[in-house]
Interface confidence: medium
Amino acid sequence: MMTGTIETTGNISAEKGGSIILQCHLSSTTAQVTQVNWEQQDQLLAICNADLGWHISPSFKDRVAPGPGLGLTLQSLTVNDTGEYFCIYHTYPDGTYTGRIFLEVLESSVAEHGARFQIP
């Protein structure tokens, strides 16, 4: 039975040209996290393997940095970075937990962070 929950940074916004940290946190489970995958739509941005560490997809390595923690830092943001991002926690024995973050990249300097929320 999957008892865990993923807490994410929720809906967030950032300025064009700036940086943003995408964060997820798995709680309420004793399952072992074997790997965390970060995806944008159907593209794999990065993985953090519990055994072997980080891997950033080659096409994103110039603009994506690992961390902090199991999070992901996006740099040099463009309007095209607007969209859904998913953190996918592979755990044993529970299975897969997925968290969703929506990022809006704004032209103006009125970017504010949204509230945190939980995905059961």
């Epitope: 790997q35 794999l44 993985i47 393997n49 519990a50 072997l52 980080w54």
Partner: antibody, heavy 118, light 107 residues
């Protein structure tokens, strides 16, 4: 030019031990995760083990867990695989392979043959 | 563990033919798929990474496509040096797993 040169293979009896080495050159060895992959005669490729760039993290296939140990010496640009309690089914060509990140293999050595037989 | 299934296991083709090899993952691996070429007695050589990106130095007649669970390696016009065995491999999660291989033989 990236070069990976394996050595240490040979004939060993069941239950015996071998230590494979992989000498790396042509790139900054300490910046790369490394893996061992094997290929039994006439068969496909099977991942054996991997190690992070600093040697602090390792991972093993279930088939070798508890018997094989991967390690590295970044000062010598060398990757190792200590193989104990060898079985007939461990007979294979063993390749060392470079991983630019953690699990992305891009270059392979030419392999060393390990034969386990009585 | 993620299982990788390749088809066909072997095929016969002629120089100039268009050749397609498929690989299916037992679960979604996004675009985290690589293709390797191996010739007898030689080490594997990376052809395609991230499902569709051509490794530096690899001829443009090789191309890859797909995402999720279904992937394809295409050789647009088979050349004499392309007769070899081709393997797909997922690098989505450990343990890394390979397809069973596809042997491309001369017709």
């Amino acid at each position: 030019e990236v070069q990976l040169l394996e050595s240490g293979g040979g004939l060993v009896q069941p239950g015996g031990s071998l230590r494979l080495s992989c000498a790396a050159s042509g790139f900054t060895f300490s910046s790369y995760a490394m893996h061992w992959v094997r290929q039994a005669p006439g068969k496909g490729l099977e991942w054996v083990s991997g190690i992070s760039s600093n040697g602090g993290s390792t991972s093993y296939a279930d088939s070798v867990k508890g018997r094989f140990t991967i390690s590295r010496d970044n000062s010598k640009n060398t990757l190792y695989l200590q193989m104990n309690s060898l079985r007939a089914e461990d007979t294979a060509v063993y390749y060392c392979a470079r991983a630019p990140y953690s699990v992305w293999i891009d270059y392979w050595g030419q392999g060393t043959l390990v034969t386990v037989s009585s | 563990d993620i299982q990788m299934t390749q088809s066909p296991s072997s095929l016969s083709a002629s120089v100039g033919d268009r050749v397609t090899i498929t690989c299916r993952a037992s679960q979604s691996i996004s675009s985290y798929l690589n293709w390797y070429q191996q010739k007898p007695g030689k080490a594997p050589k990376l052809l395609i990474y991230a499902a569709s990106s051509l490794q530096s130095g690899v001829p443009s007649r090789f191309s890859g496509s797909g995402s999720g669970t279904d992937f394809t390696l295409t050789i647009s016009s088979l050349q004499p040096e392309d007769f070899a065995t081709y393997y797909c491999q997922q690098s989505y999660s450990t343990p890394l797993t390979f397809g069973g291989g596809t042997k491309v033989e001369i017709k």
